[in-house]
Interface confidence: medium
Amino acid sequence: KSSNEATNITPKHNMKAFLDELKAENIKKFLYNFTQIPHLAGTEQNFQLAKQIQSQWKEFGLDSVELAHYDVLLSYPNKTHPNYISIINEDGNEIFNTSLFEPPPPGYENVSDIVPPFSAFSPQGMPEGDLVYVNYARTEDFFKLERDMKINCSGKIVIARYGKVFRGNKVKNAQLAGAKGVILYSDPADYFAPGVKSYPDGWNLPGGGVQRGNILNLNGAGDPLTPGYPANEYAYRRGIAEAVGLPSIPVHPIGYYDAQKLLEKMGGSAPPDSSWRGSLKVPYNVGPGFTGNFSTQKVKMHIHSTNEVTRIYNVIGTLRGAVEPDRYVILGGHRDSWVFGGIDPQSGAAVVHEIVRSFGTLKKEGWRPRRTILFASWDAEEFGLLGSTEWAEENSRLLQERGVAYINADSSIEGNYTLRVDCTPLMYSLVHNLTKELKSPDEGFEGKSLYESWTKKSPSPEFSGMPRISKLGSGNDFEVFFQRLGIASGRARYTKNWETNKFSGYPLYHSVYETYELVEKFYDPMFKYHLTVAQVRGGMVFELANSIVLPFDCRDYAVVLRKYADKIYSISMKHPQEMKTYSVSFDSLFSAVKNFTEIASKFSERLQDFDKSNPIVLRMMNDQLMFLERAFIDPLGLPDRPFYRHVIYAPSSHNKYAGESFPGIYDALFDIESKVDPSKAWGEVKRQIYVAAFTVQAAAETLSEVA
């Protein structure tokens, strides 16, 4: 039999059959089932859900479904000593206390085990002191405070608004500024869309709503006690003092009602400009400390959370490939939630469930994919991507030899405006071709393709008539596969029309109000956007697992490499004198990019012409495509970030959610004019150019004719 016959038992079983089997009604039903109680990582409820999913995936027809457990460091509030923040007067009396929990949403008043808002992995502590308002606590916000305004955060408690960047970066920045505590709050400017009511009457954040979340700076390490290795039964665990990425100062999140009480008394310096003002009726004074009559009052934090080694469970399902069973296409998304997980993660988990069901239906009718598909329900994503990272650490040797692609499947929606895709350039053409074949769910685009509505609503900033596809950053379970192992990765979801607020999430993110009703009433009553996301994610997996030649186009990598080289060169050229003084040249990088472009072009020509009926040549060409992403991995990793090993992309050092291109060079150049030792600083720039140029050249050579 030809390989084509082996994977297509009957002509019916093509991509269309798979897509037609996906049903919005099923996704709705699965979402309801997954959101009736909390599924916090490390709890019995989440273990029971893991077993339910294992059982259902078996029923759907997967070849095997196993639980993979690990014992990792998690963090929980102390049930008998709640966390809170108070304002104390000169006698030490608490004259105001923040709320201990969110008012439960209608219908959920009697649900037990709703974890109160907390910042996971905060150390215990009861610091007291003056408050300093630090805007979003970004690198540039602290530059403004320390350098321009000369406000010293040392020994102060800082209050920062959520949004723009990952909360862990905020805490890291505050620590570096010398703060002794951090209060995080949701400002209505970022979490209350004008003209929309707050939950339960709309999708906005009420004043008592609070965003939970971890505040780690793991840089891809996984379990803080076992970096680089799986947290299995015989693991050697670091002491807590040596744990990776734990914050050193107490941190706690609050809602905007409580934030109002803290911010309204602020004195000291006025906000430097309008970008520091939110939407509360407060002056947004920076401080330090309270104004006039209140100047003797202080803020005190009471944090009693504990870190505990706890068992977590991934569900791993396998659908064996008929022709290349040793080539893995992975679809993974997490199962654990902060509370009900109406959007994060269960809108994604419900889609994965329906994709598994559709693949299982085809398999029961005699079909198999060409390559093996692995399905994963990850645990403890909210605690630092722990489930996915530990599994990848345990299986790293298999994955680096056999991993074709990883498609992530967290929240299917963060809005209902248009598609959002972040992926490796290798997948650009796959995504374009697939979305041209899918129908748009958008109003006003009836009968039009998803590609058309997506391109209209989210155009590429570079290429006319094409949609925007973003760089992969982090903050989700693709991280270990892409940034550490170099497996081609992608993610897709429906998003909002909120380009200026890219990283603030949707208003009810990680709050108790993220319920089934939120989705069913306000975001996607017909579940048509969920269905579209299922078609995109499932369609990508289908093509990656079933196409004879892998649907990767290496020429798209060549295009972005040139763009990224131009960008980093222009950043460096802001310092022409130093580049001259220290003999900094980008010639080697541009030469490597040129070579990559030429070799990729020739490879693509050979890809059109080779004999696809020769299984050895086919496998050889596919391996060159599969291993291209791997070729961008530097085994030594990035400076001080050994688990971020991709030379072309890494999470930004200033915002884990965002991707940065040529991150080694970028970080070496960042704020270089402030470096005391310019010779050393520019020497590091030169070293990073060398690493990048070598890596691009080495990757290019993997695409050359093998002999």
Epitope: R147, D148, S154, G178, H575, Q577, E673, S674, P678
Partner: antibody, heavy 116, light 107 residues
Amino acid sequence: EVKLVESGGGLVQPGGSLKLSCAASGFTFSNYWMNWVRQASGKGLEWVAEIRSQSNNFATHYAESVKGRFTISRDDSKNTVYLQMNSLRTEDTAVYYCTRRWNNFWGQGTTVTVSS
Amino acid sequence: NIVMTQSPSSVSASVGDRVTITCKASENVGTYVSWYQQKPGTAPKMLIYGASNRFTGVPSRFSGSGSATDFILTINNLQPEDFATYYCGQSYTFPYTFGQGTKVEIK
């Protein structure tokens, strides 16, 4: 090679004025914050003033002892930083050094003497 | 203002000796401390920045340590060209301030 060359020092009477200049070369001057630091004869170092780069809105900061009397400014087109000193006092007598941010590079200094 | 207090104010030593100079800040300055060497009639030169990092071209016999409020400059195997006055300085907050200096003299 980074080079800072001060000029404009001299003898002036109390209450008089003087303008010091510092010509910079060997680095992208416009990116860097610049400082003036002074040293009275046989005494220690005293920071006087700082001016930030354009990206920091040319923000200026002064020691309490000179605030309201001295003005630091820069001309990026000429790679030069200035210190305009008014209402000079005898205690302002010192060698004035121009330094680059964090005081990692220093000029050779120019002497200011305030005496009647 | 943050006061930087150096000790001793002077030290007599011989070539080959090990010399230790301490600098105490009146409040926490993190690691925003630099050390400078000044010879008579010349401008100061940076030796150490960020409390412990040797500046370009500075010999390895010079080392710095400390954080928060207590800082140390150590000169191992003192050389004839090392006889000079040494200053610590903080750039943590305005006004930038310096220690009063430590003179290293020939014994």
